[in-house]
Interface confidence: medium
């Protein structure tokens, strides 16, 4: 077995980092491979072990427990096949952050002519991402997802108000939200679970 190139790693910056390796042949990741990793701050910390699983016949993925990361953290990692080291390297969780997807996306009637969307940021107040995340809200027609509006929410509060009449009346719409860090390098989270609602408002007399 040979490792092809470097792994792709990202961290949710709260409890888990995920690395994915491409191999030169089909492999049963969990029985043939083993990943050892340790936080380099503790020079004599215990080696932690992650048992990879297959994400494809020649691709192994490992979800490593990394409790409460800080910006300076760096992990030493070694991928082994029985008694042979296939790869070694290091990973900084703060260097490639893919935040947890928001949840509890909810639509509220704000005032008569506005909708209010709220969602939950899943990071506690002692985590750097608690006040750092920016959001992207995607609102699309349920019957035609290619027709959509995107709102970039650059303020900290997980909420968005928008006029009811910016959308068509008598149409079902779907909303979803994702987040990313402003301070740390990384990518957008996965999209949150979506919500769907029926957009209805009374047209002004002149438009009826």
């Amino acid at each position: 077995i040979k490792v092809l190139g470097e792994p792709t790693c990202f961290s949710d910056y709260i409890r888990t980092s995920t690395c994915e390796w491409f191999l030169d042949s089909a492999v049963d990741c969990s029985s043939q491979l083993c990943l050892h990793y340790r936080l380099m701050f503790f020079e004599f910390s215990e080696n932690l072990t992650c048992i990879p699983r297959n994400s494809a016949s020649t691709v192994c993925v490992c979800h490593m427990e990394m409790n409460r990361p800080v910006q300076s953290d760096r992990y030493q990692m070694e991928l082994w096949a029985e008694h042979r080291q296939l790869w070694q390297g290091s990973f900084s969780p703060s260097g490639n952050v893919k935040p947890l997807a928001p949840d509890n996306l909810t639509l509220h009637t704000n005032v008569s002519d506005e909708w209010l969307l709220t969602w939950n940021n899943l990071y506690p107040s002692n985590n750097l991402l608690y006040k750092d995340l920016i959001s992207m809200v995607n609102i699309s027609r349920e019957d035609n997802p290619a027709e959509f509006i995107v709102y970039n929410v650059t303020y900290k509060e997980p909420r968005l108000s928008f006029p009811i009449n910016i959308l068509m009346s008598g149409v079902y719409y779907t909303a979803r939200v994702r987040v990313r860090s402003q301070i740390l390098t990384g990518t957008w989270s996965e999209w949150s679970p979506s919500i769907t609602w029926y957009n209805h408002f009374q047209l002004p007399l002149i438009q009826r």
């Epitope: 503790f42 020079e43 300076s72």
Partner: antibody, heavy 124, light 107 residues
Framework: QVQLVESGGGLVQPGGSLRLSCAAS????????MNWVRQAPGKGLEWVSA???????RYADSVKGRFTISRDNAKNTLYLQMNSLKPEDTAVYYC??????????????????WGQGTLVTVSS | DIQMTQSPSSLSASLGDRVTITCQAS??????ISWYQQKPGQTPKLLIY???RLQTGVPSRFSGGGSGTSFTLTISGLEAEDLATYYC?????????FGQGTKLEIK
């Protein structure tokens, strides 16, 4: 509150052996690294050895191969087995609990709590 | 191994004075240094960790600074109870090492 109580010190001849103990209370002993630090009479502090919660060890060059640090997490006790003792090992031996703190940017460690010490005298 | 050179080895100062103790590391240790106070006949006590972070319960007249290889402990407004020997400790790499100590006397 956190308490560390050393015992086992005394007078020993050069070449002899001694085992120091440090009884810990007031914290989850197995979760913390522990250290031995010594101080020769009228001199400064010298770090001697450390052991992680899981038993990984480190030593100062001056004691490597002669001293062995160990711990019994069930008994909340830290040990220092000292062999082939020399007159220059004469000192007060302190056990110290490692503390850890992290902010957004980095992690910090330090010797957070110290015992009162036990005197080891190596003399003929 | 990293050597910590502490200076001065002793100093005498008057009550209310501003006192600075320096520790020089033989190589860069980032901010991984802590400072300890040992009063006569007592066990050492943690004052500062991470070069500049004050341990809970330590008076605010104590402060730490520096980075890389040069670090300082400052007492602004010396009090009689500060009579002690002060030590720096590098915990950047094994083996840990203390400075030689600075004995602070009150004039």
């Amino acid at each position: 509150q956190v308490q560390l109580v050393e015992s086992g010190g005394g007078l020993v001849q050069p070449g002899g052996s001694l085992r120091l103990s440090c009884a810990a209370s007031g914290f989850t002993f197995s979760s913390y690294a522990m250290n031995w630090v010594r101080q020769a009479p009228g001199k400064g502090l010298e770090w001697v050895s450390a052991i992680s919660g899981g038993g990984s060890t480190r030593y100062a060059d001056s004691v490597k191969g002669r001293f062995t640090i160990s711990r019994d997490n069930a008994k909340n006790t830290l040990y220092l087995q000292m062999n082939s003792l020399k007159p220059e090992d004469t000192a007060v031996y302190y056990c110290a609990k490692s503390g850890f703190y992290s902010d957004y940017e980095r992690r910090y460690r330090y010797l957070e709590v110290w015992g009162q010490g036990t005197l080891v005298t190596v003399s003929s | 191994d990293i050597q910590m050179t502490q200076s001065p080895s002793s100093l005498s100062a008057s009550l209310g004075d501003r006192v600075t103790i320096t520790c020089q590391a033989s190589q860069s240790i980032r901010p991984e240094i802590s400072w300890y106070q040992q009063k006569p006949g007592q066990t050492p006590k943690l004052l500062i960790y991470g070069a500049s972070r004050l341990q809970t319960g330590v008076p605010s007249r104590f402060s730490g600074g520096g980075s890389g290889t040069s670090f300082t402990l400052t007492i602004s407004g010396l009090e009689a109870e500060d009579l002690a020997t002060y030590y720096c400790l590098q915990d950047y790499s094994w083996p840990y090492s203390f400075g030689q100590g600075t004995k602070l006397e009150i004039k």
